[in-house]
Interface confidence: medium
């Protein structure tokens, strides 16, 4: 039937990984499916097995090489196909021409650490992981701080419109436990999206000195 809905979405991490999600209403529960990558100007092909992530969606990672190797460029086009086994043959369930640098989602920032903490402020740094050198400085970041009694969704977003791998959080409350997360996005790419949020970094501000407010 033609009236079901289906989606095939993939992102390139800018180095050596293409992550894909295939979702389909009323999908083939017990069928073996895979994603096949077929570049237009490279000698390699790559496949990964789609594994269920929910009732009607499957995901897999095409590992193209060593994590920091630059396997694709801005001129590459990779034909991506979802293939599902039907008896003895494979049937094409979805197909697209994938332009890696138009569909970017970087890895979450790593190595978050408190550089300096005071009663009302905290300086935090991080690193980006497996990001292409092609970006040079053309990256932006979003950060958020979890305050006591609030949820992550309530936390205001702080935007850093340049490649700045540190932040100074101000107007914090003394002697209070906080958590901090950051994510990254290249400026390039029509369908580019934010990386996942980093692992939260927990920190505590210093208590106020007795008799004075610092």
């Amino acid at each position: 039937a033609v009236n079901g809905t289906s989606q095939f979405t993939c992102f390139y991490n800018s180095r050596a990984n293409i992550s894909c999600v295939w979702s389909q209403d009323g999908a083939l529960q017990d069928t073996s499916c895979q994603v096949h990558a077929w570049p237009d100007r490279r000698r390699w092909n790559q496949t990964c097995e789609l594994l269920p992530v929910s009732q009607a969606s499957w995901a897999c990672n095409l590992i193209l090489g060593a994590p920091d190797s630059q396997k694709l460029t801005t001129v590459d086009i990779v034909t991506l196909r979802v293939l599902c086994r039907e008896g003895v043959r494979w049937r094409v369930m979805a197909i697209q021409d994938f332009k890696p640098f138009e569909n970017l989602r970087l890895m979450a920032p790593i190595s978050l650490q408190v550089v300096h903490v005071e009663t009302h402020r905290c300086n935090i740094s991080w690193e980006i992981s497996q990001a292409s050198h092609y970006f040079e400085r053309h990256l932006e970041f979003e950060a958020r701080t979890l305050s006591p009694g609030h949820t992550w969704e309530e936390a205001p977003l702080l935007t850093l419109k340049q490649k700045q791998e540190w932040i100074c959080l101000e107007t914090l409350t003394p002697d209070t436990q906080y958590e901090f997360q950051v994510r990254v996005k290249p400026l390039q790419g029509e369908f580019t999206t934010w990386s996942p949020w980093s692992q939260p970094l927990a920190f505590r501000t210093k208590p106020a000195a007795l008799g004075k407010d610092t």
Partner: nanobody
């Protein structure tokens, strides 16, 4: 907004040939997967074939395998469906569709549809 206009349909004798064309407006034609679908009287619309901008195609339904061929001219913003050895059961309205990625069948990602062109195969 991409507009798709099919042409080339008509009445043909069984065993004959037709070439359907689908002309697309828009500057990013080569970015789209282009597909042909058909809908016979009283039946659901069914997938026939798709071709990517890099001219890679999906597999064919057994009913048309070896008889139909898809091609595209990115410079002319046109996709073609060459149909040979036509049979009465190929009678249908043939539709052109475009999408960034084309699920085959369900059509969740179809972005644009043409109005269709009627192919009638008489015995």
């Amino acid at each position: 907004q991409v507009q798709l206009v099919e042409s080339g349909g008509g009445l043909v004798q069984a065993g004959g040939s037709l070439r359907l064309s689908c002309a697309a407006s828009g500057r990013t034609f080569s970015s789209y997967v282009m597909g042909w679908f058909r809908q016979a009287p009283g039946k659901e619309r069914e997938f026939v074939v798709a071709i990517t901008g890099t001219r890679r195609t999906t597999d064919w339904p057994d009913s048309v395998k070896g008889r139909f061929t898809i091609s595209r001219d990115n410079a002319q913003n046109t996709v073609y469906l060459d149909m040979n050895s036509l049979k009465p059961e190929d009678t249908a309205v043939y539709y052109c569709a475009s999408a960034r990625g084309l699920p085959v069948p369900p059509l969740g990602d179809i972005i644009h549809w043409g109005e269709g062109t009627l192919v009638t195969v008489s015995s």
